[in-house]
Interface confidence: low
């Protein structure tokens, strides 16, 4: 009886999440299996979150808006071992949106999620920031190795979307 | 194959007006920044004008600022230089660009020209 | 405003010869991508981001470089090698050239 009422209370939330995501991927998750983590098919996962990368070409606002629309923000990168996951689905002759801005141009930078700008757990390319004048981050593939660069928002990039994984 | 062909090229007197345009093809036109560069006499390359991919932003260096006016039709896949007050020292041959489609951005393909010379 | 130096403006090489053109930014920059392009025709991509190579440019050729100097390098020297070669920056919002290298045969 209480596996039964789970089912149809997942069912439920699962039709919920349908009006939004045509098809969700889940995993069992939890000490006894019986939590089901799930992403947006086909968005990829790690850890507790979800991520879908967007090929379109658009300016930094744009490119936070389409991952809005989908219920999602640029990605905030919060652990090389996150960045390392990430940068597996990229090509590395490409550049990549980050939810990391600086409005200003005053070297203020901010996640588009309000998570405090944390100097020592960043991934800044050798040089990086070097202008005021751009004020969105990217990640590219430089000198071997993926990091960051600041670039001016208005140019068209590719872009990282980020969200919390549904659970059921 | 991606092709950009630019036309309009001619002989103006100093003071005149000319409008080139630059039709391209086999990409999706609406999905780039374009680009107008010029040729002098001496073989020196200089960027003209850019234009954001929707049309909104224009970008043009201080010598051509106030006479030359870039512009798009994305409907059309064709991109165009308005040049007004013209001096002798615009005789150049000048080229359409397209950037390459990631940053850092390089250009990936040129026009082959078309001539302006500006004399009386 | 960022300034591109190349140097030589004009160099001759013999058949067979190892070739640097030089390019200096008046300040530190972070990539440079170069354009070889032969009489009559348009620039063609030659080397983008610094070492990359455009498509169909043959290995004999290399680019690197980093902060205010980068260069091109030709291994060589081959016959169908003579152009005018130029960098190139795009420091937004401008786009700079370097003067040019008129490269010709010995």
């Known amino acids: 009886n209480f596996m039964y009422s789970k089912t149809v209370k997942r069912l439920s939330k699962l039709q919920e999440y349908q009006q939004y995501y045509p098809s969700l991927t889940c995993v069992m998750e939890g000490k006894d299996m019986e939590d089901w983590s799930c992403c947006p098919t086909p968005w990829t996962s790690f850890q507790s979150s979800c991520y879908f990368i967007s090929t379109v070409m658009q300016s930094w606002t744009k490119s936070q808006n389409n991952c809005s629309v989908m219920g999602a923000d640029l990605v905030v990168i919060n652990t090389k071992e996150e960045q390392d996951f990430i940068t597996q689905n990229l090509k590395i002759n490409s550049a990549y949106f980050l939810g990391l801005s600086d409005p200003k141009g005053w070297r203020h930078w901010q996640w588009v999620d309000q998570t405090p700008y944390n100097k020592n757990v960043t991934f800044w390319h050798s040089g990086e920031p070097n202008s005021p004048d751009e004020r969105c981050a990217i990640i590219n593939f430089r000198s071997e190795e993926w990091g960051w660069n600041d670039v001016h928002c208005h140019v068209p990039q590719k872009s990282i979307c980020k969200m919390k994984k549904i659970y059921i | 194959e991606v092709k950009l062909v630019e036309s309009g090229g001619d002989l103006v007197q100093p003071g005149g007006s000319l409008k080139l345009s630059c039709a391209a093809s086999?990409?999706?036109?609406?999905?780039?920044?374009m680009y107008w560069v010029r040729q002098t006499p001496e073989k020196r390359l200089e960027w003209v004008a850019y234009?954001?991919?929707?049309?909104?932003?224009?970008y043009y260096p201080d010598t051509v600022k106030g006479r030359f006016t870039i512009s798009r039709d994305n409907a059309k896949n064709t991109l165009f230089l308005q040049m007004s007050r013209l001096k002798s020292e615009d005789t150049a041959m000048y080229y359409c660009?397209?950037?390459?489609?990631?940053?850092?951005?390089?250009?990936?393909?040129w026009g082959q020209g078309t001539a302006l010379t500006v004399s009386s | 405003e960022i300034v591109l130096t190349q140097s030589p403006a004009i160099t001759a090489a013999s058949l067979g010869q190892k070739v640097t053109i030089t390019c200096s930014a008046s300040?530190?920059?972070?990539?440079m991508h170069w354009y070889q392009q032969k009489s009559g025709t348009s620039p063609k991509p030659w080397i983008y981001?610094?070492?990359k190579l455009a498509s169909g440019v043959p290995a004999r050729f290399s680019g690197s470089g980093s902060g205010t100097s980068y260069s091109l390098t030709i291994s060589s020297m081959e016959a169908e090698d003579a152009a005018i070669y130029y960098c190139?920056?795009?420091?937004?919002?401008?786009?700079?050239f370097g003067g040019g290298t008129n490269l010709e045969i010995k």
């Open positions: 660009a397209r950037h390459s489609p990631s940053f850092p951005y390089y250009f990936d393909y």
């Open positions: 086999g990409f999706t036109f609406s999905d780039y920044y």
């Open positions: 234009i954001s991919y929707s049309g909104d932003s224009t």
């Open positions: 300040s530190s920059v972070s990539y």
């Open positions: 981001e610094i070492s």
């Open positions: 190139q920056l795009w420091n937004y919002p401008l786009i700079t």
